[in-house]
Interface confidence: low
């Protein structure tokens, strides 16, 4: 098979030798009967470059051909070549170079006595010769010609057609349709590549992604896909992935955590506007944000507690002496005194020391403005020292501490995390700097919490963030941390980087994985 870009085709159609004579006017010998002259005719064809004056001599630069005997004297030639398998009509001259658009053609009709002797050198055998030169453009149409020399006529036609996959004026443009990794196209009339639907680019190797797929952050391996580059997500790969653990934040670029209004911290998890978001202060108290998710409440008179949730009972413990009854007023109280007593808290008595009013060894002294007062010994109280003091009754110990009455004093046994005489000092659990890797410590009650920097987690920020934390492995796969990445150990029947692909069922037998196919398939 000669490689070529096109072919010159010559179709011999009809030859007429009216008298059966040679070119030298001699009779063709060898007739078996009348007519006496019978020219057994074959042809020599020579195709060469354009010559202003055509020379029949070699070389036939574009090719030459010698036909078998095609007929006697006058005959027509069918397309295809007829009975003789050694001859095909049209005669084809393949070209391995660009068709120049011009040619010279020599056709000699020759006579032979024997079908086996097709020598063309003997001039005595020549019946007629045509020598012509022509311009010819590439095309399917045949150019028809008739050569007459008086005694003979030769009717023939010719054309130059491109080989399959060759196009253009000189058949110099090569285009073979394909639909594989190297291109997805058919060929246009001039040999230009016409991309199949879904493909683009000079060689139609670039798939056209899902319409709307972000050109920068998405890509595709086949038409209509939209696969996201690292850090992007969504159907069109136009949503950035926030920093892992980002709570009340957004991103413009991957791994950002830009806090929404009112939020702060690395993960935007610290409420900077706790007062507005949560309204923690009760009973008309004033709330003040103190940052990092904390606040303070300024209580209105008559209220107490961290959120001013407790109404203060000014009658507790009872301020009224000598059996006076107490009435709670807003931010105040009033005492109703029993007979014989008076004063704001019924502290004044109509009695005097002469009446011996002081009990339990209390020392009595008369007051200049009337009445008396008792100075009680240790362990007793009351206007008349009538009450044995229960030092724990006033609940002097804070934060759940246990109060121990020592007779003339008390002792507070603090719960874990508190200290001080009344257990009202919160022990600073951050003092030992428990947060590793630059974490920020926040003190609690017998506790602390750490706000970790990016890349760390755990109670003490000592654990690097697990790349498996966000469950990247699908279909029951096991995720393993692998230093600079994670690796999914797929369940049987699944494959792909994240075990997201259902593998085709294999016939039973040993599990041999085709390494090349499998890996290239994942690319």
């Amino acid at each position: 098979q000669v490689w070529s870009s096109g072919v010159f085709e010559l179709k011999l159609q009809e030859f007429v030798n009216k008298k059966g004579l040679l070119g030298n006017r001699n009779c063709c010998r060898g007739g078996a009967g009348p007519p006496p002259c019978a020219c057994r005719t074959f042809f020599r064809v020579c195709l060469k470059h354009y010559q202003a004056s055509v020379s029949p001599e070699p070389p036939c630069t574009y090719g030459s051909a010698v036909t078998p005997v095609l007929g006697v004297d006058s005959f027509s030639l069918p397309d295809g070549g007829g009975a003789d398998s050694a001859f095909s009509n049209p005669i084809r001259f393949p070209f391995g170079f660009t068709w120049p658009g011009t040619f010279s053609l020599i056709i000699e009709a020759l006579h032979t006595d024997s079908p086996d002797d097709l020598a063309t050198e003997n001039p005595e055998r020549l019946i007629s010769r045509l020598a012509t030169q022509r311009h010819l453009t590439v095309g399917e149409e045949w150019s028809q010609d008739l050569h007459s020399s008086g005694r003979t006529d030769l009717k023939y036609s010719y054309r130059f057609v491109c080989d399959e996959h060759y196009y253009g004026e000189g058949c110099s443009v090569f285009c073979r349709p394909r639909d594989d990794a190297f291109g997805h196209f058919t060929c246009g009339e001039r040999g230009e590549k016409v991309c199949n639907p879904g493909w683009k680019g000079p060689y139609c190797t670039e798939p056209i992604c899902l319409p709307g797929c972000d050109e920068q952050h998405g890509f595709c391996d086949k038409p209509g896909e939209c696969k996201c580059r690292v850090g992007w997500q969504g159907r069109y790969c136009d949503e950035c992935i926030r920093y892992p653990g980002c709570l009340h934040g957004t991103c413009q670029q991957p791994w950002q955590c830009n806090c929404q209004e009112g939020w702060g911290g690395l993960f935007c998890n610290q409420d900077l506007n706790y007062c507005t978001h949560h309204k923690p202060c009760k009973n008309g108290a004033t709330c003040t944000n103190t940052g990092q998710g904390s606040y303070t409440c300024s209580c209105r008179p008559g209220y107490t507690g961290a959120t001013c949730e407790l109404g203060i009972d000014e009658c507790d413990p009872s301020p009224c002496k000598n059996g006076g009854s107490c009435t709670d007023l807003e931010n105040s109280y009033s005492c109703t005194c029993p007979p014989g007593f008076y004063g704001k808290i019924c502290e004044l008595s109509a009695m005097t020391c002469a009446d011996g009013p002081c009990f339990n060894g209390g020392r009595c002294s008369d007051s200049p403005d009337g009445g008396y007062s008792c100075r009680c010994p240790v362990g007793y109280s009351g206007f008349n020292c009538e009450k044995k003091i229960d030092y724990c009754s006033s609940s002097p110990c804070s934060n759940g501490a246990k109060c121990v009455d020592l007779g003339d004093a008390y002792l507070c046994r603090c719960q874990a995390g508190f200290s001080g005489r009344h257990c009202d000092d919160n022990v600073d659990d951050c003092a030992s700097s428990p947060c590793a890797n630059g974490g920020t410590c926040r003190d609690g009650v017998n506790d602390f919490s750490c706000t970790c920097p990016p890349g760390y987690t755990g109670r003490n920020c000592s654990a690097p963030v697990s790349r498996c934390e966000h469950a990247p492995c699908h279909n029951g796969a096991t995720c393993h941390e692998r230093g600079h990445r994670y690796v999914c150990e797929c369940a049987r029947g699944y494959g792909g980087p994240n075990c997201q692909f259902l593998l085709p069922e294999l016939p039973p037998g040993p599990a041999v994985v085709d390494l090349t196919e499998k890996l290239e398939g994942q690319g």
Epitope: V230, H484, C488, C490, N498, C499, L519
Partner: antibody
Framework: QVQLVQSGAEVKKPGSSVKVSCKAS????????ISWVRQAPGQGLEWMGG????????NYAQKFQGRVTITADESTSTAYMELSSLRSEDTAVYYC?????????????WGQGTLVTVSS | DIALTQPASVSGSPGQSITISCTGT?????????VNWYQQHPGKAPKVMIY???NRPSGVSNRFSGSKSGNTASLTISGLQAEDEADYYC?????????FGGGTKLTVLG
């Protein structure tokens, strides 16, 4: 067919640095990890570190931490390994190797190796 | 430096079977199924023969097989052939990095 082609042999003086390249062709470069493995004359294999070009994050063996830098250029499908503060015991053949992902996890394609000789 | 322990050498006659062991710890061979075996002929780059304990890449003879028990992995070559003569290295992942065995030289006698 995947191919990893490494740069040529190098002769270096102690204390200097060497940078070896590894160009990949015939596969998807970014999706796979590229590791560097060395082999001293007559000795066994030693993993130095690796990188997934897609993430640009490198991981190094503790022994080489601070002395080796592994980088990758996605646009040219090339990985690089730079080893600094060279000493005579760094004389070895340095291989780059592609690691099949997830369900494969082995070095399935290797470069031809680059001999680095450290000598004064 | 060598984290996994392999015998320095093993030998066998053609047609015989041999087994090369690779002993690690609970933090590499014992934990992960990332045990790989590589064959290396002199002057050549290594070639993976078994990956993930017991899987054989396409193109590798079924005479090669792998297994694991506890902290020890094994490579078995049955029906030994002359071309099997080479160095064999086991490798595993140990949470942060790849570790290799010291290598085993396989000699095919005769």
């Amino acid at each position: 067919q995947v191919q990893l082609v490494q740069s040529g042999a190098e002769v270096k003086k102690p204390g200097s640095s060497v940078k070896v390249s590894c160009k990949a062709s015939g596969g998807t470069f970014s999706s796979y990890a590229i590791s560097w493995v060395r082999q001293a004359p007559g000795q066994g294999l030693e993993w130095m570190g690796g990188i997934i070009p897609q993430f640009g994050i490198a991981n190094y063996a503790q022994k080489f931490q601070g002395r080796v830098t592994i980088t990758a250029d996605e646009s040219t499908s090339t990985a690089y390994m730079e080893l600094s503060s060279l000493r005579s015991e760094d004389t070895a053949v340095y291989y780059c190797a592609r690691e099949g992902y997830s369900d494969y996890s082995a070095f399935d394609y290797w470069g031809q190796g680059t001999l680095v000789t450290v000598s004064s | 430096d060598i984290a996994l322990t392999q015998p320095a050498s093993v030998s066998g006659s053609p047609g015989q079977s041999i087994t090369i062991s690779c002993t690690g710890t609970s933090s590499d061979v014992g934990t992960y199924n990332y045990v790989n075996w590589y064959q290396q002929h002199p002057g050549k780059a290594p070639k993976v023969m078994i990956y993930r304990v017991s899987n054989r890449p396409s193109g590798v003879s079924n005479r090669f097989s792998g297994s694991k028990s506890g902290n020890t992995a094994s490579l078995t070559i049955s029906g030994l052939q002359a071309e099997d003569e080479a160095d064999y290295y086991c490798s595993s992942w140990d949470e942060h990095s790849y570790v290799f065995g010291g290598g085993t030289k396989l000699t095919v006698l005769g």
